[in-house]
């Protein structure tokens, strides 16, 4: 049973100040912690109430984290990432891709490199146009009688 | 719907050996950091030892040498063996479990974690 999630993909720059107990967040993955297929990218797995993450409110559970203070965090080891958000310092720079979910299919949750996800424009442009055709042939219809 | 169950506490003479077991169920350990804690009467609890999600083992110092940490995901269960144990080890220990690792503290912090178990009593004696 082949299911399909399509996903609407952001990207935003989220500077967090850390907070007494932190940045107040957990984090997957990496090259020896694969945590979506065919992706060793580093994604939010927890954020924690109260933490500085949780209070400024636009980190999500399930983001990936892409940078944090402008490096990249592309085929690194999970604890060289983890040491890397610890040693980042008071101000932390986040470069962050939302992932919304906008269709479900019966299996749960996939990988970037997975080919068989559409994006999301692919199918509303041409529903939009479809419609817009069908509206133009009903009016000239009308018209008609 | 996430639990821990502890088991395998006990009465032990002081310098006997003991394994207590944290066994998992509703989420997948692979990807979780799993800590052991413990409270002895009129304390506060304290980490013990933890094992984070690619499988580092971290020990607090009146515990290195005597303790093991050790995660079996196939079988989603976490054990503690505890060698030349003493009348202080006496106490409740409990397992805790947090998805992924934190990026603030190493696992042995016991507020990075969400879920916990219901204990198991060690008794040095």
């Known amino acids: 049973m082949n299911g399909r999630v399509d996903y609407l993909v952001t990207e935003e720059e989220i500077n967090l100040t850390r907070g007494p107990s932190g940045l107040g967040f957990n984090i997957v993955g990496g090259t020896d912690q694969q945590y979506v297929s065919n992706d060793s990218g580093i994604y939010v797995s927890r954020i924690k109430e109260n933490g500085a993450a949780a209070l400024d409110g636009r980190l999500q559970e399930g983001d990936k984290i892409l940078s944090v203070n402008g490096q990249d965090l592309k085929n690194l080891l999970h604890q060289d990432a983890v040491d890397l958000f610890r040693n980042a310092g008071y101000a932390v720079s986040l470069r962050v891709q939302h992932r919304l979910q906008v269709q479900n299919g019966p299996i749960g949750h996939r990988g970037e490199g997975d080919p068989s996800g559409i994006p999301i424009f692919m199918v509303l442009v041409p529903v939009f146009a479809l419609t817009m055709v069908a509206a133009w042939a009903f009016m000239r219809y009308r018209q008609q009688l | 719907d996430v639990q821990l169950v502890e088991s395998g506490g006990g009465l032990v003479q002081p310098g006997g050996s003991v394994r207590v077991s944290c066994v998992s169920s509703?989420?997948?350990?692979?990807?979780?950091?799993i800590g052991w804690f413990r409270q002895a009467p009129g304390k506060e609890r304290e980490g013990v030892s933890c094992i984070d999600s690619v499988g580092r083992a971290y020990y607090v110092d009146s515990v290195k040498g005597r303790f093991i940490i050790s995660r079996d995901n196939a079988k989603n269960t976490v054990y503690l063996q505890m060698n030349s144990l003493k009348p202080e080890d006496t106490a409740v220990y409990y397992c805790?479990?947090?998805?992924?690792?934190?990026?603030?503290?190493?696992?042995?912090?016991?507020?990075?974690?969400?879920?916990w178990g219901q204990g198991t009593q060690v008794t040095v004696s």
């Open positions: 805790a479990a947090d998805f992924g690792s934190s990026v603030d503290s190493t696992c042995l912090n016991n507020q990075q974690y969400d879920y």
């Open positions: 509703g989420f997948i350990l692979d990807y979780y950091a």
